[in-house]
């Protein structure tokens, strides 16, 4: 059976396509190619007489067609108007004609696309942004890329207009991109230049650093305030409610106890119109802001119940501190047998009873800090009663 095949089936505009003929009968007078799905003299492209080896152009000939002795038809410099069906009619020497129809599709070489946006400076959690991939072309697939990855599944991302438009609902600061669109057809593909979003947001609640609260007299107080914000926030400082200065950093040299108080950082974004504040308490004191870990010792760790006594001692090199004791997570003393002495440095238990067995630890603290010792284990034993060795009467 007479058949035709397009090589290639999908053709780039400006390129060429060859309509190949298979199973051409042997004894022929000639053949004709037509544009369309049927033989129509008004749409004849070319005829070829085998006897004279002469090609005759038809009404639909554009000058770009070449017919070969094997009936194949070459069309050069194709346009999108060439897309469609082509019919070959073979005039056989028995005067019975055969026909075969083939087709091909011409696609344009796609240009480099560009991205247009309805809002390039959206406000976080408030605005939506619609990106559109330009130009609009027929038979084209539109793809989108965010951060060089295909679109994630998200209820905030919507595709429309044949995927040509990407809408971000309620943008966040993480939606800056970059965004790229890609257009594809069966013969070409092209990607746009990246586009980034300038998402306006903030300020978030400011953070004051360093995190220290306690300072010694004579030290320099240097505080820095930062709030995530776009555009960057404008900062101001208040001490105990009184405005000080409009800077991101606050510096006070050689502080005294009089500089103790509440330090407020105020962050403002003039575009969003939002303000945020953070308050930090600063304490200037001679007291050590950090208390060292105390050591705990016992006069003995294994004692005999109802007989022995024990002394537990909590040692520290810090001054201006207080000491408290704990047994099984409970504060001591918890009974008449327990006594504290030497400024709570020593815990005495006399006499020790079975219920006194367990872990003990001490804690040292001042108004601004505290620390606790490692636990110590107290074991309480009781002497066993002597066994009676008697023979039972036999």
């Amino acid at each position: 059976q007479l058949t035709t095949e397009s090589m290639p089936f999908n053709v780039a505009e400006g390129k060429e396509v060859l309509l190949l003929v298979h199973n051409l009968p042997q004894q022929l007078f000639g053949y004709s190619w037509y544009k369309g799905e049927r033989v129509d003299g008004n749409r004849q492209i070319v005829g070829y007489a085998i006897g004279t080896q002469q090609a005759t152009p038809g009404p639909a000939n554009s000058g770009r067609e070449t017919i070969y002795p094997n009936a194949s038809l070459l069309i050069q410099n194709v346009t999108q108007n060439d897309t469609g069906f082509y019919t070959l009619q073979v005039i056989k020497s028995d005067l019975v004609n055969e026909e075969a129809t083939g087709q091909f599709h011409v696609y344009p070489e796609l240009p480099k696309p560009s991205i247009s946006s309805n809002n390039s400076n959206p406000v976080e959690d408030k605005d939506a942004v619609a990106f559109t991939c330009e130009p609009e072309t027929q038979d084209t697939t539109y793809l989108w890329w965010i951060n060089n990855q295909s679109l994630p599944v998200s209820p905030r991302l919507q595709l429309s207009n044949g995927n040509r438009t990407l809408t971000l609902l309620s943008v966040t600061r993480n939606d800056t991109g970059p965004y790229e669109c890609e257009i594809q057809n069966p013969v070409s593909a092209n990607r746009s230049d990246p586009v980034t979003l300038n998402v306006t947001y903030g300020p978030d609640t400011p953070t004051i650093s360093p995190s220290d609260t306690y300072y010694r007299p004579g030290a320099n107080l240097s505080l820095s305030c930062y709030a995530a914000s776009n555009p960057p926030a404008q900062y101001s400082w208040l001490i105990n409610g009184t405005f000080q200065q409009s800077t991101q950093e606050l510096f006070i040299p050689n502080i005294t106890v009089n500089n103790s108080g509440s330090y407020t950082c105020h962050a403002n974004n003039s575009v969003t119109g939002c303000n945020r504040t953070t308050v930090k308490t600063i304490i200037v004191t001679e007291l050590s802001p950090v208390v060292a870990k105390p050591q705990i010792k016992a006069s003995k760790t294994t004692v005999t119940g109802d007989k022995d006594s024990v002394n537990l001692t909590c040692s520290t090199n810090d001054t201006g501190i207080s000491i408290r004791w704990f047994f099984k997570n409970q504060s001591l003393p918890s009974s008449e047998r327990m006594k504290l002495s030497q400024g709570n440095t020593t815990l005495s238990i006399n006499p020790v009873k079975r219920e006194d067995a367990g872990t003990y630890w001490c804690e040292v603290f001042n108004p601004i800090s505290k620390n606790q010792s490692d636990p110590i284990m107290l074991n309480v034993n009781y002497n066993a009663l002597p066994q009676e060795n008697g023979l039972s009467p036999g």
């Epitope: 007078f29 000639g30 008004n42 007489a49 006897g51 020497s93």
Partner: antibody, heavy 121, light 111 residues
Framework: EVQLLESGGGLVQPGGSLRLSCAAS????????MSWVRQAPGKGLEWVSV????????YYADSVKGRLTISRDNSKNTLYLQMNSLRAEDTAVYYC??????????????WGQGTLVTVSS | QSVLTQPPSASGTPGQRVTISCSGS????????VSWYQQLPGTAPKLLIY???KRPSGVPDRFSGSKSGTSASLAISGLRSEDEADYYC???????????FGGGTKLTVLG
């Protein structure tokens, strides 16, 4: 069944005009080249004109060029011959004939019964 | 005068083989296909041979065609009385851009 039926012949004065028609049936008219062939009384066959299946290619015998015009209406399956400036030597039976080879191996496989044109004063 | 030359007449008895010649030039017979037509008295011509030697369906194989150079021949074997008719050769002429016929040969079946 293939049929070709000519009409429009008759008596006409020299210099006059006539239009012949050939109604085709029994085949796909638009797929075939068509010709007019004439035969003067007692004489041999003389080819007059041919028109391709789409009407894009037309040829005439030197003896009729400029006076006779061939045309076709594929929607009506009809072939025409417009005859102007007629002369006595145009007197003949006019046949329409089908070429099944689209002109690649010109031949006439079916003929009409003919229509007589007489040019006389 | 016809472009293709045929003998004006030919004759033969029933059962005989008769040959009719047709002479032309390189612009017609030499480079194009030859056809032969039979015209019975008072009727339209009928195609007997096309493409030099091919017979349409329905034409008896007593009719055969051949071509050599710028000449063609129609042979009728086993001649019958109903073969009495005028016979024309025809071909496309590339110089004239038109179809040309021979002057015709009147075949008589003697009887």
């Amino acid at each position: 069944e293939v049929q070709l039926l000519e009409s429009g012949g008759g008596l006409v004065q020299p210099g006059g005009s006539l239009r012949l028609s050939c109604a085709a049936s029994g085949f796909t008219f638009s797929n075939y080249a068509m010709s007019w062939v004439r035969q003067a009384p007692g004489k041999g066959l003389e080819w007059v004109s041919v028109i391709s299946h789409g009407g894009g290619s037309i040829y005439y015998a030197d003896s009729v060029k400029g006076r006779l015009t061939i045309s076709r209406d594929n929607s009506k399956n009809t072939l025409y011959l417009q005859m102007n400036s007629l002369r006595a030597e145009d007197t003949a039976v006019y046949y329409c004939a089908r070429d099944p080879t689209k002109g690649y191996a010109p031949t006439f496989d079916y003929w009409g019964q003919g229509t007589l044109v007489t040019v006389s004063s | 005068q016809s472009v293709l030359t045929q003998p004006p007449s030919a004759s033969g008895t029933p059962g005989q083989r008769v040959t009719i010649s047709c002479s032309g030039s390189s612009s017609n017979i030499g480079n194009n296909y030859v056809s032969w037509y039979q015209q019975l008295p008072g009727t339209a011509p009928k195609l007997l041979i096309y493409a030099d030697s091919k017979r349409p369906s329905g034409v008896p194989d007593r009719f055969s065609g051949s071509k050599s150079g710028t000449s063609a021949s129609l042979a009728i074997s086993g001649l019958r009385s109903e073969d009495e008719a005028d016979y024309y050769c025809g071909a496309w002429d590339a110089s004239l851009n038109g179809y040309v016929f021979g002057g015709g040969t009147k075949l008589t079946v003697l009887g």
